[in-house]
Structures are given as C-alpha cells and as structure tokens.
C-alpha cells in the first residue's frame, strides 16, 4: 500500500458521512473512508467522510496520531461504519503508525 | 467565550408565525450546526431542525417540515427559525443550541430560551 | 427509527449513588449523549460520546452504555443534582432523538 500510484479509473467507495463537511448526506463517495476523532475547543469531537482525492487522504492517512487528532482510513463500501478513531494514549508512542486498514 | 443569545418572548395568536432570532458569539460562525430544540410546558426536549451555516441548507425534523424555516446571516453570525400556521400546541420555550467546532452529535452550547406563547 | 425511553422519575437519599437509564433498540450502535436541566434554565450537557465529561461537570457523574441501555450515574449524589435529566442520540441528519426525561428528586 506503501507507494500505491492512484489508478486511472480509481474505485469509489460508499463511506458513512458523519460530519459538518456532509452537508445534508448521511452517505458520500470516494477513494478512500474516514473516522477521525479530534479535541475542538475541549471537546472530543468524532467525524467520518470520504477523500475524494487519492492525494488527499494518502496524506491525511499517514499522520501519526497526535494528543489532538487521530484518523483511521479504510477502503470498501462502508468500512468505516463499525471504526472509531482513537487518540494515543499517555505514554504509549505510535512508531510508523499508520492507522490504514484496507478492507 | 461561546455565547447564543436569543430574542424575547413573543404572544402570537393561533394562525400567525414567529420569527426567532440567535446570535452566536465566539467561534467561527461557518464552522458548526445552529440546531433548534423546543420544549412544551412541563414537557421534555425535541429537536426541530438545524442548519449548517457554510451550506446554507436545513434538515428539518419530520414532525415540523413545511412548518419551519431556519436560516442564517454568516454576515451578523445570527440563525433564525420560523414557524408558521401556529396553533396553542405551540406555545413552548425554543432553544437554540450548537456542538464544539464540526462537532454534530450533541449540544455544548445553548441559547437562554425564548419563551413563545400561541393565544387568541 | 430509534426511540428513547427514561423512567419519569428517580428518587435518590443524599450520598447515595443515582442511576438514570435511557432505552431504546441496539442504542449501543449509538452514541448517548445527557442533559441536566433546571427549572426556568437552559440544559446542560453533563456526559457526551456515551462515558465523556466536559470540563467542569463534577466527577461523580459518569455514563455506561451497552446493549439497549444507557445509563446516567450520579455517585454521591448532592442536593444540587436535583433536576430534570435527559438522553439523547444522533440518528441521522433528519433526526436527533431525546428520551422523554427523568425527574431526580434528592430526598431529605
């Protein structure tokens, strides 16, 4: 998956959408899905969507949880129902984590 | 400091709409639902419907739709719901309420109450 | 479409621990979220995300949610607890659900 090119007709996945950035959808499409949990003016705040955009979420997908946010990316038709993100907890540290589950 | 301020109290008679206005203060106005929650005398919370300033289109509760309207000026970060074809069943106190930045679950925030009464 | 079911009322004697449970079918797939309510105020939420406390909601209150049940602990409940307690859940963007409320009357 390290290095995987984006494919020229890439695949779509049906994600949950749980989020500001849904708009009026429960559901969105894209090449990759989404849980994230991140801490917003003190409050543990839990989103899912999709990335639209290969590069998108390969970037996003590779980032290390930090105290603040975490993000698990998953590929197939509504992997990220049953995937909670989680945050790292104290003491505990992430090397080369990558938080990806191919489904 | 986050702030939901609300209008006051209105008397309305059956038929009539009303108009209720929240001002929101702290935070960036685009970057969370406005959600309105009303409560019966003596009865417990329901939702009504909540918009999404950035899209500027509301989802509104089953029970409510094509009764209500809520909006919102980005520009005075202030959301609206209105209520038409009132009837005394209407007569409740209305909150306005929103989550944490992109947060949609549940309510962090809530406005004072405004108090709307339906008489003849 | 999930519906939320609290008892009307819980009495609890000072000290004592109270527990406000909310049901409804698989709610466990769900998040519960809880409110405080006094009369003539605004609610406030209490736990969120099913077990999570906001800053400056005391210790003693705490939340479980398995099966079809959520519950609201209240350990070592004190006389300022006395308020009305409601559940809620995210059903979908059409439809965020509230249990019909707890009274919870701290005797003595």
């Known amino acids: 998956m390290e290095d995987e090119k984006p494919k020229v007709n890439p695949k779509l996945y049906m994600c949950v959408c749980e989020g500001l950035s849904c708009g009026n959808e429960d559901h969105c499409e894209g090449q990759q899905c989404f849980s994230s949990l991140s801490i917003n003016d003190g409050f543990h705040v839990y989103q899912k969507g999709c990335f639209q955009v290969y590069e998108q979420g390969k970037m996003t997908c590779k980032t290390p949880p930090s105290p603040g946010q975490a993000v698990e990316c998953c590929q197939g038709d509504w992997c990220n129902r049953n995937i909670t993100a989680q945050l790292p907890t104290k003491g505990k540290s992430f090397p080369g984590t990558q938080n990806f589950h191919l489904e | 400091q986050v702030q939901l301020v609300q209008s006051g109290a209105e008397v309305k008679k059956p038929g009539s709409s009303v108009k209720v206005s929240c001002k929101a203060s702290g935070g960036t106005f685009s970057s969370y639902a406005i959600h309105w929650v009303r409560q019966a005398p003596g009865q417990g919370l329901e939702w009504m419907g909540r918009i999404i300033p950035d899209f500027g289109t509301a989802n509104y509760a089953q029970k409510f739709q094509g009764r209500v309207t809520i909006t919102a000026d980005e520009s005075t970060s202030t959301a609206y719901m209105e209520l038409s074809s009132l009837r005394s069943e209407d007569t409740a106190v209305y909150y306005c309420?929103?989550?944490?930045?992109?947060?949609?679950?549940?309510?962090?925030?809530w406005g004072q109450g405004t108090l709307v009464t339906v008489s003849s | 479409d999930i519906e939320l079911t609290q008892p009307p009322s819980v009495s609890v004697s000072p000290g004592q621990t109270a527990s406000i449970t909310c049901s409804g079918d698989?709610?466990?797939?769900?998040?519960a979220h809880w409110y405080q309510q006094k009369p003539g105020q605004a609610p406030v939420l209490v736990i969120y995300?099913?077990?999570k406390r906001p800053s400056g909601i005391p210790e003693r209150f705490s939340g479980s949610n398995s099966g079809n049940t959520a519950t609201l602990t209240i350990s070592g409940t004190q006389a300022e607890d006395e308020a009305d307690y409601y559940c809620q859940v995210y059903a979908s963007v059409h439809r965020m659900v509230f249990g019909g409320g707890t009274k919870l009357t701290v005797l003595g």
């Open positions: 995300y099913d077990n």
């Open positions: 698989n709610l466990r797939k769900y998040s």
């Open positions: 309420a929103r989550g944490p930045t992109q947060a949609i679950h549940y309510f962090a925030y």
